[in-house]
């Protein structure tokens, strides 16, 4: 029958809530790692690849030790929204060129979306301040060439991989303090 009307909802266990978010993050990290390996195998590209529209990496020396849960979740959600947008853009702009990676890219997009929903839920359950809706971002310009798109794919997956590592490390570290 559930709790009587008007009674407060049982407060969630923050460790358990955080834990399930970490698991989704690790799962997405593993998907990203596998896809990065495939991309490097099928479309080798040496050196560091950058894309100006990608978020700057959220961590810096010493920053992990001083993290607070609200700032981690807020920053992670903002960065992952940007990566979701970039993955969607990549699939649209490079559909034919990256056909061999398409099922995996689609799965990555779905799981990224799921993690974003999970973060939103976690923030509301932990009664963290909700962010105002993001202003619409300017559309991403199509890549100038197939090679430009492949370099963009390397930058997007490489950046997402590092961001998810930061997230797993930060969230697990915060979990030890709860």
């Amino acid at each position: 029958p559930g709790p009587p009307p008007g009674s407060p909802r049982a407060s969630p266990d923050p460790r358990a809530e955080l834990d399930s978010t970490v698991l989704l993050t690790r799962s997405l990290l593993e998907d990203t790692r596998q896809l990065t390996i495939q991309l490097k195998d099928k479309f080798p590209a040496d050196g560091d690849h950058n894309l100006d529209s990608l978020p700057t990496l959220a961590m810096s020396a010493g920053a992990l030790g001083a993290l607070q849960l609200p700032s981690v979740l807020t920053r992670l959600r903002a960065d992952l929204l940007s990566y979701l947008r970039h993955v969607q853009w990549l699939r649209r702009a490079m559909g034919s060129s990256l056909k061999t990676l398409e099922p995996e890219l689609g799965t990555l997009q779905t799981r990224l979306d799921r993690l974003l929903r999970r973060l939103q839920l976690l923030m509301s359950r932990l009664a963290l301040p909700q962010l105002p809706p993001d202003p619409p971002a300017p559309p991403l310009a199509p890549p100038s060439s197939t090679w430009g798109g492949i370099r963009a794919a390397h930058a997007i997956l490489g950046g997402l991989h590092l961001t998810l590592d930061w997230a797993v490390r930060g969230l697990l570290l915060l979990k030890t303090r709860l």
Partner: antibody, heavy 119, light 111 residues
Amino acid sequence: EVQLVQSGAEVKKPGASVKISCKASGYTFTDYNMDWVKQAPGQRLEWIGDINPHSGGPIYNQKFTGRATLTVDKSASTAYMELSSLRSEDTAVYYCARGELGHWYFDVWGQGTTVTVSS
Amino acid sequence: DIVLTQSPASLALSPGERATLSCRASKSVSTSGYSYIHWYQQKPGQAPRLLIYLASNLASGVPARFSGSGSGTDFTLTISSLEEEDFATYYCQHSRDLPPTFGQGTKLEIK
């Protein structure tokens, strides 16, 4: 060939500090975390902490927080671990190890650096 | 912290025999498709060497006679047919939470 080469053995007095280096070669240094593990005689292996070379962001086992400092020099593909306020229980072999991002399993290890703390 | 207990502490077997090493965690280290347990081999005077990662994946360059299994709290490293070079100490390690911790080791000796 993927390799991690550590600096040589150290003998230190109690209260002193030691800084160990770990030079990586044969792979892209920023694609993996660098972890540090302690092996004291007759004790379990113990994880000290890790650092992401891309950002220089370290995390530590609470047991070593405040005494261990992890740093990297990206241009030299080298990681460092400094341990301060040394005591006799710090006598051990210290290893650097390459860690897969987000997973903490270690697929390449340095040869180890023996640190002896003795008055 | 999660505590890993390995058994037996030591094991004496002959080349050609099958070795079964156990690792038990104080709480589950498995979740949605992954088990965060890894196995290492260490010989005297050498660094540990990764054998198995994420419970059952064979690390690069490791012979197929090594295999890992298990989920939840109970894990096993199996060496199907022992060779001379397999006599060493074996450690399990988890990475389910921070900090990652190691078992106390199982020493595999020649009978």
